[in-house]
C-alpha cells in the first residue's frame, strides 16, 4: 500500500483546509523538475529563475553566466541551444504551436565570443525545425518543408531539398500521422555522430485523404483547416530516407537508403533512425500490418558514395500474439564495437526484457529476465548499462533505475534508486552526462518530486537540484486525500488499481465513486507518482472516492495482459473497469447508487462504452473528446491494434465496437459529451456521430463543445471544462453546491 501522508493530527485539524477547485485551476500545487542540459561529462547549462543561461561545472562547484537575460529579452527568447563548439547560441522566439510536438519559431544566432548577434545571412522565418550539428556549429533547418544547411551561422544556406510543399511533401519534418503515431517528434532528420552526414525522411502525402474542419476565429467567414490524415484503411504517406554528405553537399547530393525487400513488398512504415558511427546507420522499418519489424544496419560505400544495407545485417522482430513492440517498436542502443546492440523486446515468457544482439536475433543473449518488464535503456558505457524497470517489490506502476556491469563476467545488477528515498520516491527517470560521468535522477513520486545529481561511478548523491520546498510548505495546511495502490485478482487476471480516498475516510461510511479511465493499449494509469489535480480536489473537498484501474491491454505486466485486446478494442478494457467496480462495491464503503465514470480520448471511448454496457452500475458519466468508431481514427495507431477495416480482415469488429451501435443503452444514464471543434487528433466528427445516434434514438444527453479548441482543451477552456464537469458530477451525486 502506498499511503500519501495527509499530515492530519487532531490538534491541527482546524487549521487544515480542503483543496479547492480554484487551487487546481490556478496550478497552486504544481511541482518543478530539474533536467540538466548536459554539454560535457561534467558541465551542464540551466536557465535560472531570472532567465540567465548559466554554466555549471560539477567538479569545481563553480558556475558562471554565458548568456544574460537582457540578451534573451532583446529578442523575446523563450528557449536556447548552445552549439557544440560553444561559440554560438540559437535563441528561439515567436513560438507558434502546430500539433502535439511541432511548432514554428523565429531563430536568432548569438555569437558568444564577440558578444553580439550574427548579422548577415539571417535565418528565414518562421522555421519549422532547427538544430546544431553534434560537433562544431553547422546548422540544419527546415523552412517551408525544405531542408537547408549552413556550414557556419553567418554563411549563406545550402538548399538540400527543393520539392517541399505544404500538406504534400514534407522533408526533415513528419506529417501529422508520423508525428503523432510513429516518431513522436517534431523532426525527421538526424545528424551522424560527428556531423559528417545528415539523414532525413521525406514524406509524400499527395494521395492521403484530407480531414477538413472549420476554425471559427474572429472573421466574418470561418477558415477551413485541411490536414492530410489517413484514417484506418486509407492511403498512407509514402516515406523515403536520404543521407547527404554535409562537408560536400553538392558533390553527389542526397543518397536514398534502400528499404529491405521483405518490407518493400507491401505498404510499410519507417519507424526510427539511429546513427552508429559516421559511416554506419541503423534504420527500422515496419510492415503496415504492424507485427513485423525489420532493423537494417547500413554502411557507407566510399567508392560509390552510396549506402549499402546487406541482408546479413537485417534483423527481424515479429509478434505472433499481437503487434510488434509495446506502444512503439523499441530502438537499439549500440555498444562500442559499433555492430552489436542492446534492445528491449519480448522474451519467451512474454515479458519485455533487454537482449544483447551480436549476430542474429535468434542468438540474442537475454540480459534481464523475470515476471516484470524492462522499460527503458538510458545509457550503455564501456562497463555499465543503465536501465529502468518495474521489478522492485513487484509493483508494475513503479520505475527504478538499475545498473548492470557489462565489463565483468558474470554481469552484476544493482538497483541505483530502490532505497534512496523509499517512501517518497518510487518512480524515477534519469538524465546522463557524456560517458555517464554524472547523472541526474528525477523522482516523480509518490511523495513530492525531487531532482538530484549523482556521481556516475559511485552513484553517490552530490547535491539536490530541486526539492520543491515551496510546494512542501504550501501543502502543510492542506488536507490531501489518501492514496493507495493495490491489486485485485479476478479470473487469473491481475487488476492493479489506485484508490484516492477523502482525508477523513471511514470504511464504515458510504461514499460516491468516480472511475477515471484511460485504458488505451500499452498505457498505464496506476503509477506511483505525485499529483494534486482535479480528482485530488474531488476526494479532498467533495468527499468522493476516485479509482483508476489498469485492465487488459495496459502495459508493463507482460504480453498476456497487453495483447489481450489485439483486434478486439472496446471489449476487455470495458469489462475490466466493470469488474473492478463490482469488487469496489463488495468492499462495503461505496454507495452503489452513486457511481460515475469519466475519461478523455481513449478514456472517453471506454467511459462511453461502460455507460452503455447495460449493467446498471453507473448513474452518470463524462466522455471528453472520445473516439466513437475506430474507422474515424488514425491508420498507424488503429491498425496496430485492430488490423484493417476490410471484410477479409477485421471490419466486423470495427462495426461492432462503435459507441453509436450502443446508443439505445444510454437511456438510463446521465451522459455528458464534450469535444473541441478544432481537434486535429480525435476529430469532432466522433462526438458529432455519437450525438446524431443519440438524437436518432431519442435519448436525452448533455453536451458541451469548445469552439476552436484542440484535443487538449487548454487555456480558459480548461477552467470552464473542469468547472462544468464538477457541477455535473455534484448534481449526479446529489452533493450541495
Amino acid at each position: 500500500i502506498v499511503l500519501r501522508p495527509s499530515r492530519v493530527h487532531n490538534s491541527e485539524e482546524n487549521t487544515m483546509r480542503a483543496l479547492t477547485l480554484k487551487d487546481i485551476l490556478n496550478g497552486t500545487f504544481s511541482y518543478k523538475t530539474f533536467f540538466p542540459n548536459w554539454i560535457s561529462g561534467q558541465e551542464y547549462l540551466h536557465q535560472s529563475a531570472d532567465n540567465n543561461i548559466v554554466l555549471y561545472n560539477i567538479e569545481t562547484g563553480q558556475s558562471y553566466t554565458i548568456l544574460s537575460n537582457r540578451t534573451m529579452k532583446s529578442v523575446n527568447a523563450s528557449n536556447y541551444g548552445l552549439s557544440p563548439d560553444r561559440q554560438f547560441v540559437y535563441l528561439e522566439s515567436d513560438y507558434s504551436k502546430l500539433w502535439r510536438y511541432s511548432y514554428t519559431a523565429t531563430y536568432y544566432i548569438y555569437d558568444l565570443s564577440n558578444g553580439e548577434f550574427v548579422r548577415g545571412n539571417e535565418l528565414p522565418r518562421p522555421i519549422q525545425y532547427l538544430c546544431w550539428s553534434p560537433v562544431g556549429s553547422k546548422l540544419a533547418y527546415v523552412y517551408q518543408n525544405n531542408i537547408y544547411l549552413k556550414q557556419r551561422p553567418g554563411d549563406p544556406p545550402f538548399q538540400i531539398t527543393f520539392n517541399g510543399r505544404e500538406n504534400k511533401i514534407f522533408n526533415g519534418i513528419p506529417d501529422w500521422v508520423y508525428e503523432e503515431e510513429m516518431l513522436a517528434t517534431k523532426y525527421a532528420l538526424w545528424w551522424s555522430p560527428n556531423g559528417k552526414f545528415l539523414a532525413y525522411a521525406e514524406f509524400n502525402d499527395t494521395d492521403i485523404p484530407v480531414i477538413a474542419y472549420s476554425y471559427y476565429g474572429d472573421e466574418q467567414y470561418p477558415r477551413t483547416i485541411n490536414i492530410p490524415y489517413p484514417k484506418a484503411g486509407a492511403k498512407n504517406p509514402v516515406v523515403r530516407i536520404f543521407i547527404i554528405d554535409t562537408t560536400y553537399p553538392a558533390y553527389v547530393g542526397p543518397q536514398e537508403v534502400p528499404v529491405p525487400a521483405m518490407i518493400a513488398s507491401s505498404d510499410y512504415y519507417f519507424s526510427w533512425l539511429t546513427w552508429v558511427t559516421d559511416e554506419r546507420v541503423c534504420l527500422q522499418w515496419l510492415k503496415r500490418v504492424q507485427n513485423v519489424s525489420v532493423l537494417s544496419i547500413c554502411d557507407f560505400r566510399e567508392d560509390w558514395q552510396t549506402w549499402d544495407c546487406p541482408k546479413t545485417q537485417e534483423h527481424i522482430e515479429e509478434s505472433r500474439t499481437g503487434w510488434a513492440g509495446g506502444f512503439f517498436v523499441s530502438t537499439p542502443v549500440f555498444s562500442y564495437d559499433a555492430i552489436s546492440y542492446y534492445k528491449i523486446f519480448s522474451d519467451k515468457d512474454g515479458y519485455k526484457h533487454i537482449h544483447y544482439i551480436k549476430d542474429t536475433v535468434e542468438n540474442a543473449i537475454q540480459i534481464t529476465s523475470g515476471k516484470w518488464e524492462a522499460i527503458n535503456i538510458f545509457r550503455v558505457t564501456q562497463d555499465s548499462l543503465f536501465y529502468s524497470s518495474n521489478e522492485f517489490e513487484e509493483y508494475p506502476g513503479r520505475r527504478n533505475i538499475y545498473r548492470i556491469s557489462i565489463g565483468s563476467y558474470p554481469p552484476s545488477k544493482k538497483c541505483v534508486t530502490c532505497h534512496l528515498r523509499k517512501e517518497r520516491c518510487q518512480y524515477y527517470t534519469a538524465s546522463f552526462s557524456d560517458y555517464a560521468k554524472y547523472y541526474a535522477l528525477v523522482c516523480y513520486g509518490p511523495g513530492i518530486p525531487i531532482s538530484t545529481l549523482h556521481d556516475g561511478r559511485t552513484d553517490q548523491e552530490i547535491k539536490i537540484l530541486e526539492e520543491n520546498k515551496e510546494l512542501e510548505n504550501a501543502l502543510k495546511n492542506i488536507q490531501l486525500p489518501k492514496e493507495e495502490i493495490k491489486k485485485l485478482e479476478v479470473d487469473e487476471i491481475t487488476l492493479w488499481y489506485k484508490m484516492i480516498l477523502p482525508p477523513q475516510f471511514d470504511r464504515s461510511k458510504k461514499y460516491p465513486l468516480l472511475i477515471q479511465v484511460y485504458g488505451g493499449p500499452c498505457s498505464q494509469s496506476v503509477r506511483s507518482v505525485f499529483a494534486v489535480n482535479w480528482i485530488s480536489y474531488l476526494a479532498s473537498k467533495e468527499g468522493m472516492v476516485i479509482a483508476l484501474v489498469d485492465g487488459r491491454g495496459t502495459a508493463f505486466q507482460g504480453d498476456k495482459l497487453l495483447y489481450a485486446v489485439y483486434r478486439k478494442l472496446g471489449v476487455y478494457e470495458v469489462e475490466d473497469q466493470i469488474t473492478a467496480v463490482r469488487k469496489f462495491i463488495e468492499m462495503g464503503f461505496i454507495d452503489e447508487k452513486r457511481i460515475a465514470i469519466w475519461g478523455w480520448s481513449y478514456g472517453g471511448y471506454v467511459s462511453s462504452l461502460a455507460l452503455a454496457s447495460g449493467t446498471g452500475l453507473f448513474k452518470c458519466g463524462i466522455a471528453v473528446a472520445p473516439v466513437s468508431s475506430w474507422e474515424y481514427y488514425a491508420s498507424v495507431y488503429t491498425e496496430r491494434f485492430m488490423g484493417l477495416p476490410t471484410k477479409d480482415d477485421n471490419l466486423e469488429h470495427y462495426k461492432n465496437s462503435t459507441v453509436m451501435a450502443r446508443a439505445e443503452y444510454f437511456r438510463n444514464v446521465d451522459y455528458l459529451l464534450i469535444h473541441g471543434t478544432a481537434d486535429d487528433n480525435v476529430h469532432f466528427q466522433n462526438s458529432a456521430q455519437i450525438a446524431k445516434a443519440l438524437v436518432n434514438a431519442q435519448v436525452d444527453f448533455q453536451a458541451m463543445w469548445y469552439s476552436d479548441q484542440n484535443h487538449g482543451l487548454s487555456g480558459l477552456s480548461t477552467n470552464h471544462l473542469y468547472t462544468h464537469m464538477t457541477h455535473f458530477l455534484k448534481q449526479c451525486f446529489s452533493l450541495s453546491d
Epitope: 560535457s40 561529462g41 561534467q42 558541465e43 554554466l55 561545472n57 567538479e59 569545481t60 563553480q62 558562471y64 553566466t65 554565458i66 548568456l67 544574460s68 540578451t71 548552445l82 560553444r86 561559440q87 558568444l112 565570443s113 558578444g115 557524456d434 560521468k437
Partner: nanobody
C-alpha cells in the same frame, strides 16, 4: 582581480611552428573549460581550440591536425601548439573560458601571431 596573460606569439614563416601560453589567475579558471580564440584584422573573433577540465578537446576543421591545445592544471596554464602555420592563421590570439563568461571585461591583451608567406 582575474587576469589572463597570453604570450608566445611572433613572426614565423609559413609551415613553421609556435607555442602559445596563457597564464590564468583567479579561481574561475581552475578546472573550467578553456579555449583559444583569434581575431584577424577586420574579422570577428573565432574559436581555434577548446579543452574541458577532463582533457576533452575540440578543434574547428580549419586548424584540425595542425593545432593542439593542452593544459597544466598545477600551473594554471593552457597552451596552444601551432604547427604547419599558414598566412591565414595571422591574427591576435586570446585565451578565455570556453564558452566565455558574459560581461567579462578581462579578455587579455592577446598575443600577435604573424605568418609570412
Amino acid at each position: 582581480q582575474v587576469q589572463l596573460q597570453e604570450s608566445g606569439g611572433g613572426l614565423v614563416r609559413a609551415g613553421g611552428s609556435l607555442r602559445l601560453s596563457c597564464a590564468a589567475s583567479g579561481s574561475i579558471f581552475v578546472g573550467n573549460a578553456m579555449g583559444w580564440y583569434r581575431q584577424a584584422l577586420g574579422n570577428q573573433r573565432e574559436l581555434v581550440a577548446g579543452i574541458t577540465s577532463d582533457g576533452t578537446t575540440y578543434y574547428p576543421d580549419s586548424v584540425k591536425g595542425r593545432f593542439t591545445i593542452s593544459r597544466d592544471n598545477d600551473k594554471n596554464t593552457i597552451y596552444l601548439q601551432m604547427n604547419s602555420l599558414k598566412p591565414e592563421d595571422t591574427a591576435v590570439y586570446y585565451c578565455n573560458l570556453w564558452p566565455p563568461r558574459i560581461g567579462f571585461a578581462s579578455w587579455g591583451q592577446g598575443t600577435q601571431v604573424t605568418v609570412s608567406s
